[in-house]
C-alpha cells in the first residue's frame, strides 16, 4: 500500500517518499522506484536555506550601495547575505532593505536618548501625566497642562498621545451667603 | 523626489559668523521636522540641531549652544542655521536632513572651514 506520510527530510510524490535536497542544492528530478532524488549545488550567489523541493535556487540580497548599504556578512550556497547600513545610518527594518539617517519616536513615545554617530534613536513610551503627539527624533515627552494654575478645571483628560483640555470653572456662587464659596451647579441650590 | 540643497558655506576667521542655508523641495516642507547634521573631516556624523514643523522647538547639541540658531521660513520652504562665535572644531561639511531622511536623499551639503 503507498505511503500516505513520509519522514523527516522526504516528501511524498506519486505515491512515494523521495529524499529533499540538503541546504544549499537545488531539484533536478525526484525519485523513482529505481533512482534517489537527484539534487544540484546551488549556483554563485545563489542559496537555498532549508531541506527543500525547489528547481531554483535564490538570488542573494543586493545590498544596494545607492541606498546606503553595504555587505555585513558574505550569502553562501546555504545563507542569504547580510546588509548593514553605512557608519552613521540605521537599517529601517531587521530586513535592513534601505537606510535612514536615525528613526523617530511615534505618537505616545518621546525621545530618551538623541541618535549619535553609532546608536540610533532611543525612545520611551510617555508615562502618565506626559504626552507626546507628534512623530520626533529629539523631541521628549511634554508634561500635561496644570489647569488648576491656569485657574480652570480639566474638561477632558489626557492620555500619553494628548494633552488634557482645560475649560472655565462651571460653577455658581452659593445663594445661603456662605462667605463667598463657590458651589457647582446643581449642588445646595434646591435644583433638581 | 526630494531634494535639499545647502549653502552659505566657506571660509571663515575664529570668532567669525556664516548663516547657512538649505532650499527644500519634493515634499511638503511645512510637515517635516528638519535637522542640521554636520561631518568633519574623518570624523561621523554629529547631530547639531533640530527644529519642528511649526519652528515652535528646537534642539542644539551641547557643543554648538549658545553659538548656534536654528530657524525656519515654511513660506520659502527653507532652514536656516546661523552660526556665530565659530571655532576651528566646527569645520565639516554642513547637512539639512528632514524626518525621516534616507540615504538616497542625502545631499552634497555645504563646506564651513574656520582657520585663520
Known amino acids: 500500500e503507498p505511503p500516505t506520510a513520509c519522514r523527516e527530510k522526504q516528501y511524498l510524490i506519486n505515491s512515494q517518499c523521495c529524499s529533499l535536497c540538503q541546504p544549499g542544492q537545488k531539484l533536478v528530478s525526484d525519485c523513482t522506484e529505481f533512482t534517489e532524488t537527484e539534487c544540484l549545488p546551488c549556483g554563485e550567489s545563489e542559496f537555498l536555506d532549508t531541506w527543500n523541493r525547489e528547481t531554483r535556487c535564490h538570488q542573494h540580497k543586493y545590498c544596494d550601495p545607492n541606498l546606503g548599504l553595504r555587505v555585513q556578512q558574505k550569502g553562501t550556497s546555504e545563507t542569504d547575505t547580510i546588509c548593514t547600513c553605512e557608519e552613521g545610518w540605521h537599517c529601517t527594518s531587521e530586513a535592513c532593505e534601505s537606510c535612514v539617517l536615525h528613526r523617530s519616536c511615534s505618537p505616545g513615545f518621546g525621545v530618551k536618548q538623541i541618535a549619535t554617530g553609532v546608536s540610533d534613536t532611543i525612545c520611551e513610551p510617555c508615562p502618565v501625566g506626559f504626552f507626546s503627539n507628534v512623530s520626533s527624533a529629539f523631541e521628549k515627552c511634554h508634561p500635561w497642562t496644570s489647569c488648576e494654575t491656569k485657574d480652570l478645571v480639566v474638561q477632558q483628560a489626557g492620555t500619553n498621545k494628548t494633552d488634557v483640555v482645560c475649560g472655565p470653572q462651571d460653577r455658581l456662587r452659593d445663594p445661603g451667603g456662605g462667605g463667598g464659596r463657590l458651589v457647582p451647579r446643581g449642588f445646595g441650590t434646591g435644583d433638581p | 523626489e526630494v531634494q535639499l540643497l545647502e549653502s552659505g558655506g566657506g571660509l571663515v576667521q575664529p570668532g567669525g559668523s556664516l548663516r547657512l542655508s538649505c532650499a527644500a523641495s519634493g515634499f511638503t516642507f511645512r510637515d517635516y521636522e528638519m535637522w542640521w547634521v554636520r561631518q568633519a573631516p574623518g570624523k561621523g556624523l554629529e547631530r547639531v540641531s533640530a527644529i519642528n514643523p511649526q519652528g515652535t522647538r528646537t534642539y542644539y547639541a551641547d557643543s554648538v549652544k549658545g553659538r548656534f540658531t536654528i530657524s525656519r521660513d515654511n513660506s520659502k520652504n527653507t532652514l536656516y542655521l546661523q552660526m556665530n562665535s565659530l571655532r576651528a572644531e566646527d569645520t565639516a561639511v554642513y547637512h539639512c536632513?528632514?524626518?525621516?531622511?534616507?540615504?538616497?536623499?542625502w545631499g552634497q551639503g555645504t563646506l564651513v572651514t574656520v582657520s585663520n
Open positions: 536632513a528632514k524626518l525621516p531622511m534616507f540615504f538616497e536623499d
